[in-house]
């Protein structure tokens, strides 16, 4: 038997993936655990194997279909259960009625690229990945730039309150190496959260022209 507090959190990427983390305070013997997904009105169900990510935390991804297929909508409710094997039987450890479009976390933006770079500014674009057509333009972004001698945590956040897949960074220092990251969040969903940060994009501003005051 398992004692202690259990926490079971899942997010839908808006297309064909539900990622879950199950945390259990208290001893859990070496045992096999799974997440089972049963939609309320769909003719499919899905299972994934929970794998340890820390001492008392396990995670798995329910792959519902091809990456860009729209497997769930705002009308759906999915019963999610954590099931652990106890001898020859399965025991239910956690359960939730999961509303996918209330619990969104999109994939990190991809394809970051420098469109144009100058001495003091840089124009960067990106793309969103595996985002549902249901959002239309109802997305927002946060971006941050890593300057020399600073950490990501110190970088000020820039907010784009609309679906804008580019940014023009201003007041940069000439001939300086920077890194840039962006993340995305739908406006929909009570428990919706930010996507992971994108892979950092490294770029260098152009040197100031010789003989010019800077």
């Amino acid at each position: 038997a398992v004692n202690g507090t259990s926490r079971f959190t899942c997010f839908y990427n808006s297309r064909a993936n539900i990622s879950c983390v199950w945390s259990q305070d208290g001893a859990l013997q070496d045992t096999s655990c799974q997440v089972h997904a049963w939609p309320d009105r769909r003719r499919w169900n899905q299972t994934c194997e929970l794998l340890p990510v820390s001492q008392a935390s396990w995670a798995c991804n329910l792959i519902l279909g091809t990456p860009d297929s729209q497997k769930l909508t705002a009308v759906d409710i999915v019963t999610l259960r954590v099931m652990c094997r106890e001898g020859v039987r399965w025991r239910m450890m956690a359960i939730q009625d999961f509303k996918p479009f209330e619990n969104l976390r999109l994939m990190a933006p991809i394809s970051l690229q420098v469109v144009h770079v100058e001495t003091h500014r840089c124009n960067i674009s990106w793309k969103i990945s595996q985002a549902s057509h249901y959002f239309e333009r109802h997305l927002e972004f946060e971006a941050r730039t890593l300057s020399p001698g600073h950490t990501w945590e110190e970088a000020p956040l820039m907010t784009l309150k609309q679906k804008q897949e580019w940014i023009c960074l201003e007041t940069l220092t000439p001939d300086t190496q920077y890194e840039f990251q962006v993340r995305v969040k739908p406006l929909q969903g009570e428990f919706t959260t930010w996507s992971p940060w994108s892979q950092p994009l490294a770029f260098r501003t152009k040197p100031a022209a010789l003989g010019k005051d800077t």
Epitope: D40, R41, R42, R43, S69, Q70, T73, A74, V75, D97, H133, Y134
Partner: antibody, heavy 116, light 107 residues
Framework: QVQLVQSGAEVKKPGASVKVSCKAS????????IEWVRQAPGQGLEWMGE????????NHNEKFQGRVTMTRDTSTSTVYMELSSLRSEDTAVYYC?????????WGQGTTVTVSS | DIQMTQSPSSLSASVGDRVTITCKAS??????VAWYQQKPGKAPKSLIY???YRYSGVPSRFSGSGSGTDFTLTISSLQPEDFATYFC?????????FGQGTKLEIK
């Protein structure tokens, strides 16, 4: 096998209410949404709303908001749809249907005639 | 509300013909589209769900295709029992809506 059996035909006067029943068998009643769809004579299909018997959750077509009431009795595996303030344009065949994949099993239909 | 526009509204064909009915959604509904067959005085019968999946017991001559806004029901070789009215439906978002129907008649 899955079956949805509806109550018999009704004749009502304008302004009255009608309550149609739908008795389910052959599957786990609590697990699947029951939808209500109506069809006026010679017309297409119109979705009215749905109820999930296990939880009692309900979603309505806003067109019927305030006039339609959906309930369930889990002891008899029966769902009810009541439509109030009837008018002549509510004359139709009313169907209950289970939602699994799409609307996979349908009741035989209940004819409701609204006439003064 | 999402409008489902079916065409044609009526169609005359002969036994053995290949018949195609189309349905256009007013906005993207993914693959959340179903097709139903209805005969006079009877309840609709489910044929296709998720745009292309046939229910068990439905003959293989019925097939569905499409995604986004454009959907098709094809009957590869019409049989006498196929003469009926066909409806498409979206169940992607509330309120669920149906096409106006296509009446398939014997030529």
């Amino acid at each position: 096998q899955v079956q949805l059996v509806q109550s018999g035909a009704e004749v009502k006067k304008p302004g009255a209410s009608v309550k149609v029943s739908c008795k389910a068998s052959g599957y786990t009643f609590s697990r699947y949404w029951i939808e209500w769809v109506r069809q006026a004579p010679g017309q297409g299909l119109e979705w009215m709303g749905e109820i999930l018997p296990g939880s009692g959750s309900i979603n309505h077509n806003e067109k019927f908001q305030g006039r339609v009431t959906m309930t369930r009795d889990t002891s008899t595996s029966t769902v009810y749809m009541e439509l109030s303030s009837l008018r002549s344009e509510d004359t139709a065949v009313y169907y209950c249907t289970r939602h699994y994949g799409s609307f996979d099993y349908w009741g035989q239909g209940t004819t409701v005639t609204v006439s003064s | 509300d999402i409008q489902m526009t079916q065409s044609p509204s009526s169609l005359s064909a002969s036994v053995g013909d290949r018949v195609t009915i189309t349905c256009k959604a007013s906005q993207n509904v993914g693959t959340d589209v179903a097709w139903y067959q209805q005969k006079p005085g009877k309840a609709p019968k489910s044929l296709i769900y998720s745009a292309s999946y046939r229910y068990s017991g439905v003959p293989s001559r019925f097939s569905g295709s499409g995604s986004g806004t454009d959907f098709t029901l094809t009957i590869s070789s019409l049989q006498p029992e196929d003469f009926a009215t066909y409806f498409c439906q979206q169940y992607s978002s509330y309120p669920f809506t149906f096409g106006q129907g296509t009446k398939l008649e014997i030529k």
